[in-house]
Interface confidence: low
């Protein structure tokens, strides 16, 4: 139909810069490349209805739906949204199309539904019709890698169930411990889903998407390598697949790996033996032992013999569900304004964890390294120095973990000073918490000696700041004291700290900071 | 919740047979080995045997071997052990337990006490 | 057969204390070691597998440590219901065998 108007719908994704929510149908913001909702006739609809590709926005982002009309003339236009009136303000471009834009600021719950833009040009009316939705994340998953043979193949597929679908890429390294560390220069990554080269000293699996990243390493055993002083551990869950990699290097091709589990051999269909010429020309065998699902009596000692090299050993338990082992105890610790300190907590868990520390509200990013006894630990030494109580969360798919710290820095007091018609108050924040005089200062005692014993009140303790104890002391105002000035003196094991206060004196109170080591 | 209950006390005169049985529940009876381990009174424990419920295969201990027999019935999810030619040193507490893998016990049933008197 | 050596033979110890008994192995049985708890009356109850596992609901003040012929039970911080006879179990090779028991008192 010649006489329709030739229209395109765009969206275009905003950076948020953090400008408040609201809506406008003209807005400059930084943003993306716009990307075409493809505006199509919606067919047996009365009137002139065009549709545009539904819109999945994130919660928080800002976005414009844009119409860009090529038709003579001018045109005025109406955005009706949930039964409301919005005001519209066309404007042309300079290929002189109308640009009509509704600009949505910090996508939220309310903000989601249906948007009609009621078009008037000289020529004919029509409806636009946009549906925008958040997007639902919590319908996203990420799940850890786990291995599959590939049939009639000697190779792995990686596999990770996940929501939207991830990237997938095999992380191999060749050198041993710490030269294996994800950015360096021994690591080859694949992104591909198959892997035929099994014979690598270390093989991971690693599936990323917007949740993040996980990896699972491939289970190995080495024969040439002295083996750990305590047993390898590797837990799994109920239903998971069982991957154990033995390896074996050898002069020449005259041995062979066998796998047992508890002095059983392993059946048939649960194990695959490569073998290779390394470049030295030494013959390099691995052997899988593999269970697709495992079951609880899958749990015991899986045992990689050889008749070339001793036998080693791992212990493989099934658990019914994932935990997380470590001592949830409070911990307390008191340490200098310059010592060197770092929090630590160590802990036995499967599925790996996910852990932060938080001090004060914020959170920090946590590592863990694991140790040569199946045990992790996370450290955190990034608390310069501030007392106060911090707390580490654990968590993995089933279980939880919390344990609370509070670390208290040896500092002389400082001591602060407010005063009322009715009392003075001194607070201080020294550790070890300290202990309080009030002084009058006199003409009998011009050094302040005179000792006020009569309506002190202290108060250890009272009161958080960022989980920071303050101490504090009050001394109710009498007709003895009225008009004098007065000190109030915060001592512990590493020193002392006054502030001299004139009570009943007209307009603000003069604090004078005397400190004495 | 994982339940092993065996049968009640015997007391037997040297030379007889005693067929100890032990009735498993709260999971899958064949997918975990069951060991029988004996406890004289005011002694330590003894390990006497493993059977496997799924193949019915066993291990005994060298000192058992010829005078004990264990046997599984799939059907009622129960494990026997039958213990022949007693002496007055069989007297004690048996117990059938469950094994994680081959290697440690994670639950027991609550024991039988076999007397051997004549 | 592999002898299972445990020292002390008996024990006493008040609540709060640290305690530790160990475990010897007549050959190197690397990690294969497992420890049982046994109240009078009652049968055993598994404390730690695999030299330092800790069996699911077993509390964190039980701990197992070691490898090859040595090994170690630490009770942290003793508490009442922990007063019983310990045992330390081979599961390297058949028959499986048990330590002569430790017997851990209240003082």
């Known amino acids: 139909n010649q006489d329709l108007p030739v229209i395109k719908c765009v969206l275009i994704n905003h950076k948020n810069n953090d400008s408040s929510v609201g809506k406008s149908s003209s807005y400059p913001m930084v943003s993306e490349s716009p990307e075409d909702l493809g505006c199509a006739l919606r067919p047996q609809s009365s009137g002139t209805v065009y549709e545009a590709a539904a819109v999945e926005v994130d919660v928080s982002a800002s976005i414009t739906l844009q119409v860009l009309v090529d038709a003579p003339g001018n045109i005025s236009c109406l955005w009706v949204f949930k039964h409301s009136s919005l005001n519209c303000q066309p404007h042309f471009d300079l290929q002189n199309r109308g640009v009509v834009s509704m600009v949505i600021l910090k996508m939220t719950e309310t903000q989601a539904g249906e948007y009609l833009l009621f078009i008037q040009s000289e020529a004919t009316n029509y409806t636009i019709l946009f549906t925008v939705s958040i997007r639902n994340t919590l319908l996203y998953t990420l799940r850890r890698p786990y291995f599959r043979k590939m049939e009639n193949q000697d190779a792995l597929v990686c596999i990770s169930e996940s929501v939207p679908e991830p990237i997938v890429e095999w992380v191999l390294c060749d050198s041993q411990g710490e030269s294996c560390k994800e950015e360096s220069p021994a690591v080859v990554k694949k992104e591909e889903k198959v892997l035929h080269e099994l014979f690598g000293t270390d093989i991971r699996c690693c599936a990323r998407n917007e949740l993040g990243r996980e990896c699972t390493r491939l289970f190995t055993i080495d024969l040439n390598q002295t083996p750990q002083t305590t047993l390898p551990q590797l837990f799994l869950k109920v239903g998971e697949p069982l991957w154990i990699r033995c390896k074996a290097v050898h002069v020449n091709h005259g041995f062979g790996l066998t796998w047992e589990l508890e002095n059983k051999a392993l059946e048939e269909g649960n194990y695959f033996e490569m073998s290779t010429y390394s470049t030295n020309r030494t013959m390099i065998r691995i052997l899988f032992a593999f269970v697709s699902s495992v079951a609880r009596n899958d749990t015991g000692y899986y045992t990689c013999s050889s008749s070339k090299h001793p036998s080693q050993s791992a212990l493989v338990t099934i658990v019914e569900k994932g935990f997380i082992n470590a001592t949830n105890s409070s911990e307390d610790y008191e340490i200098d304004q310059y010592e060197e300190f770092c929090f630590s907590v160590r802990f036995k868990a499967y599925p790996q964890i996910r852990c932060t520390w938080t001090f004060s509200r914020k959170s920090f990013p946590c590592e863990q390294k694991g140790l040569d006894n199946g045990y992790s630990i996370s450290k955190f030494c990034n608390h310069k120095h501030q007392p106060g109580e911090y707390i580490f969360h654990a968590e993995n798919d089933d279980a939880q973990f919390t344990k609370m710290f509070t670390l208290n820095i040896r500092r002389k007091p400082q001591v602060l000073a407010e005063a009322s018609a009715s009392q003075a108050s001194c607070f201080s924040d020294g550790y070890p918490l300290p202990s309080w005089t009030w002084k009058k200062c006199s003409d009998k005692s011009p050094n302040c000696t005179e000792e006020i014993t009569e309506g002190v009140w202290n108060r250890k303790a009272n009161r958080k700041v960022f989980g920071q104890w303050v101490s504090s002391s009050t001394l109710n105002m009498s007709e003895a004291i009225k008009g004098f000035l007065v000190k109030c003196c915060a001592y512990n094991s590493l020193g002392t700290s006054c502030e001299t206060i004139l009570l009943n004196s007209p307009g603000p109170f003069p604090f004078i900071q005397d400190n004495i080591s | 919740q994982v339940q092993l209950v065996q049968s009640g006390a015997e007391v037997k005169k040297p030379g007889a047979s005693v067929k100890v049985s032990c009735k498993a529940s709260g999971y899958t009876f064949t997918s975990y080995y069951m060991h029988w381990v004996r406890q004289a009174p005011g002694q330590g424990l003894e390990w006497m045997g493993i059977?496997?419920?799924?193949?019915?295969?066993?291990t005994y201990a060298l000192k058992f071997q010829g005078r004990v027999t264990m046997t599984r019935d799939t059907s009622t999810s129960t494990v026997y052990m039958e213990l022949s030619s007693l002496r007055s040193e069989d007297t004690a507490v048996y117990y059938c337990?469950?094994?994680?893998?081959?290697?440690?016990?994670?639950?027991w049933g609550q024991g039988t006490l076999v007397t051997v008197s004549s | 057969d592999i002898q299972m050596t445990q020292s002390p033979s008996s024990l006493s110890a008040s609540v709060g204390d640290r305690v530790t008994i160990t475990c010897r192995a007549s050959?190197?049985?690397?990690?294969?070691l497992n420890w049982y708890q046994q109240k009078p009356g009652k049968a055993p109850k598994l404390l730690i597998y695999a030299a330092s596992s800790l069996q699911s609901g077993v509390p964190s003040r039980f701990s197992g440590s070691g490898s090859g012929t040595d090994f170690t039970l630490t009770i942290s911080s003793l508490q009442p219901e922990d007063f019983a006879t310990y045992y330390c179990?081979?599961?390297?090779?058949?028959?499986?065998?048990f330590g002569q028991g430790t017997r851990l008192e209240i003082k």
């Open positions: 179990q081979q599961s390297y090779s058949t028959p499986l065998t």
């Open positions: 050959q190197s049985i690397s990690s294969y």
């Open positions: 059977i496997n419920p799924s193949s019915g295969s066993t």
């Open positions: 337990a469950r094994g994680l893998g081959k290697s440690a016990i994670d639950y």
